[in-house]
Interface confidence: low
């Protein structure tokens, strides 16, 4: 079988066989290498020479295959929108960025720009679990049976109640989504009837 | 003063369907976040039997999921209960629940439900 052409070859219908490795010079209508992440070109390809490619300068970075003349500035992540750095900035990757904890991305293009606040989940709810932090908002959810929550808190989980058997106690109270179940010595005169009133 | 009447309750045969009312005066429910339905048996604990927030978001124990729906009128000032397919381990006294913490927690009187043929 006839050997592949390396770059540079000829290319008469604009493509090249390696889309993500090669790409199309138009004007010597050949197909030239593209620089590895963490280079650029430092010099263009002709008929006769394929690309040269030089390492990105610190404090500079190229994340794909490029044909590209200069690297990308790395960046800071900005603390007054609120992201924080969770991966240094390498000559390969951009500096990786991560909303503050206790808050999520509310501006996005293409990566997060402006983190806010997180909601508070009111008494009664808790924050519903997502598959990755940072990424939206609080979506509070009621507590499920036999649980509780008595804050205002974006991060606060719903609680068991308390079994007052497992004391050796009796149940005064029973426990509601916000409270905790009342419990007391089995000993003591039984409340008031709680229908209709209202319990501190 | 907060008050919470119950209506609805009644005889039902199994299979059955009931529709629960809690009624509110003395406060717009919109001011409470969770509003909840609660049952006692005879000889048992009270036990929650559906909750909803502000959103309208529910949940339910394992026990009466798929089966009973809470939902909130906050126009009417009013909370539902709608149950169905009803079994005889549903009777039990119902009570409407309101949470207001830090205040306190509000309760109805209780309305009667008897499922039985």
């Known amino acids: 079988s006839q050997p592949q052409a390396v770059p540079p070859y000829a290319s008469e219908n604009q493509t090249c066989r390696d889309q993500e490795k090669e790409y199309y010079e138009p004007q010597h209508r050949i197909c030239c290498s593209r620089c590895p992440p963490g280079t650029y070109v430092s010099a263009k390809c002709s008929r006769i020479r394929d690309t040269v490619c030089a390492t990105c300068a610190e404090n500079s970075y190229n994340e794909h295959w490029n044909y590209l003349t200069i690297c990308q500035l790395c960046r800071p992540c900005d603390p007054v929108m609120g992201l924080e750095e969770i991966a240094p900035c390498t000559s390969k990757r951009k500096t990786q960025c991560r909303c503050q904890p206790g808050m999520f991305c509310a501006a996005w293009a293409l990566e997060c720009t402006h983190c806010e606040l997180l909601s508070d989940c009111p008494p009664g709810t808790e924050a519903e679990l997502k598959d990755e932090v940072g990424k939206g908002n609080n979506h509070c959810v009621p507590c499920k049976a036999g649980h509780f929550q008595n804050t205002s808190s974006p991060s606060a989980r719903c609680q068991p109640h308390t079994r007052c058997e497992n004391q050796g106690l009796v149940e005064a109270a029973p426990g509601t989504a916000q409270s905790d179940t009342t419990c007391k010595n089995p000993l003591e005169p039984l409340p008031p009837e709680m229908s209709g009133t209202m319990l501190m | 003063e907060v008050q919470l009447v119950e209506s609805g309750g009644g005889l039902v045969q199994p299979g059955g369907s009931l529709r629960l009312s809690c009624a509110a005066s003395?406060?717009?429910?919109?001011?409470?976040?969770?509003m909840a339905w609660y049952r006692q048996a005879p000889g048992k604990q009270r036990e929650l039997v559906a909750v909803i927030n502000k959103g309208g978001e529910a949940n339910y124990p394992d026990s009466v999921e798929g089966r009973f729906t809470i939902s909130r009128d906050n126009a009417k000032n009013t909370v539902y209960l709608q149950m169905n397919s009803l079994r005889p381990e549903d009777t039990a006294v119902y009570y409407c629940?309101?949470?207001?913490?830090?205040?306190?927690?509000?309760w109805g009187q209780g309305t009667l439900v008897t499922v039985s043929s």
């Open positions: 003395g406060s717009s429910i919109f001011s409470f976040e969770i």
């Open positions: 629940n309101a949470d207001a913490v830090p205040h306190g927690s509000y």
